[in-house]
Amino acid sequence: MAVTACQGLGFVVSLIGIAGIIAATCMDQWSTQDLYNNPVTAVFNYQGLWRSCVRESSGFTECRGYFTLLGLPAMLQAVRALMIVGIVLGAIGLLVSIFALKCIRIGSMEDSAKANMTLTSGIMFIVSGLCAIAGVSVFANMLVTNFWMSTANMYTGMGGMVQTVQTRYTFGAALFVGWVAGGLTLIGGVMMCIACRGLAPEETNYKAVSYHASGHSVAYKPGGFKASTGFGSNTKNKKIYDGGARTEDEVQSYPSKHDYV
């Protein structure tokens, strides 16, 4: 029950996170005009990954797209790439995790297969979240650098520029949405990985050792102490625990997920 809850919660948290990453990527307010020194301004500038906008005091808004790829800063391109990779990985992760959910039955899918898929989606969510956090952090770092550079320019009059028209940009709403969304996706991914451990078929810590006495086949099982005597080749050693019976062969044919973690 706890496993199902953990898996379900991980899925929902990741879903919210990926929706947030998509929203942040599409938002125009990645950087907003710093109004600290100029609180009363006729126009308010803000920029996104895809276009920049001007909102006039009356509310009229005009946005201009970044139609070119070549003229854009490499950092902006990198942020775009990170966010898109995050969205793609997250979307694939969501698709995989839907089929991995314990509450959804698809044919005769084994628990081990669901465990595999849960781990895969979990890892995808983790990478997706990291991509989003990295993308937003790179953009934030770029803003901080530019902010202090433009502040220095304002007070030193560097390069004979007209300082009165210098527009400084600060963190926009999209950055906070991106950070939170990335964090949620990351948490969702971790929860999926935790759920995967509970989904994996359980195994005893000891391998069964058979001691063959002359004439009779006797299997001594440490822990279970259920000896099975039999004549001929039709005899199979059974490992009995947790109310379920499986042959040793069957158990060994499905490696535990713990082997990979």
């Epitope: 509310g59 005009e62 201009r64 970044y66 139609f67 854009l72």
Partner: antibody
Framework: QVQLVQSGAEVKKPGASVKVSCKAS????????MHWVRQAPGQGLEWMGI????????SYAQKFQGRVTMTRDTSTSTVYMELSSLRSEDTAVYYC?????????????WGQGTLVTVSS | DIVMTQSPLSLPVTPGEPASISCRSS???????????LDWYLQKPGQSPQLLIY???NRASGVPDRFSGSGSGTDFTLKISRVEAEDVGVYYC????????FGQGTKVEIK
């Protein structure tokens, strides 16, 4: 083809108001901004303001703030420009011009102009 | 507001000869998207203005290739490779950022 047809010439007294219309045809009305530009006799072009026909939001040049009102009627694809408290220096030809709301922002089509004469 | 300054204000030309008009802005018109938001318009006598050049250097549809625009940032130029009689009128540069402003205009007339 794209056409912007403006209303006829007007003669007004100082202090009165004038409302000039601009009927658009040949394109999707809500996909393009509409500007108003005026030209006093023997003078250059002067930008007055802009309206987004899609939502009706407007932006006016500082000089005309409080005196100009731009509206639109999507059912008839018509934009209106009303200028109040008319003065003799408002005597000019008033043009409407459309610009793309997405790409170039340049005014690619212009109306034929409406002459507004303010005289006592 | 951005101030647009055109020169010369009057340009007498000889048909077949080249002509050049300059336009300078008080602030850079180079947008963060890599485009220069400057347009050139021609207003022929008794007519409405017509778009010649947009985004600094792109010819509008139907505009003869003898017209070309160049420049970036704050300095722009409109060139007519071979002036024809029909090119007479007043040429205006206009910046497409907020709020829009026009240059004073350059009157081109035949000598």
């Amino acid at each position: 083809q794209v056409q912007l047809v403006q209303s006829g010439a007007e003669v007004k007294k100082p202090g009165a108001s004038v409302k000039v219309s601009c009927k658009a045809s040949g394109y999707t009305f809500t996909s393009y901004y509409m500007h108003w530009v005026r030209q006093a006799p023997g003078q250059g072009l002067e930008w007055m303001g802009i309206i987004n026909p899609s939502g009706g939001s407007t932006s006016y040049a500082q000089k005309f703030q409080g005196r100009v009102t731009m509206t639109r009627d999507t059912s008839t694809s018509t934009v209106y420009m009303e200028l109040s408290s008319l003065r003799s220096e408002d005597t000019a030809v008033y043009y409407c011009a459309r610009s793309s709301a997405y790409g170039t922002y340049s005014m690619d089509y212009w109306g034929q102009g409406t002459l507004v004469t303010v005289s006592s | 507001d951005i101030v647009m300054t055109q020169s010369p204000l009057s340009l007498p030309v000889t048909p077949g000869e080249p002509a050049s008009i300059s336009c300078r802005s008080s602030q850079s018109l180079l947008h963060s998207n890599g485009y220069n938001y400057l347009d050139w318009y021609l207003q022929k006598p008794g007519q409405s203005p017509q778009l010649l050049i947009y985004l600094g250097s792109n010819r509008a549809s139907g505009v003869p290739d003898r017209f070309s625009g160049s420049g970036s940032g704050t300095d722009f130029t409109l060139k007519i490779s071979r002036v024809e009689a029909e090119d007479v009128g007043v040429y205006y540069c206009m910046q497409d950022l907020w709020p829009r402003t026009f240059g004073q205009g350059t009157k081109v007339e035949i000598k």
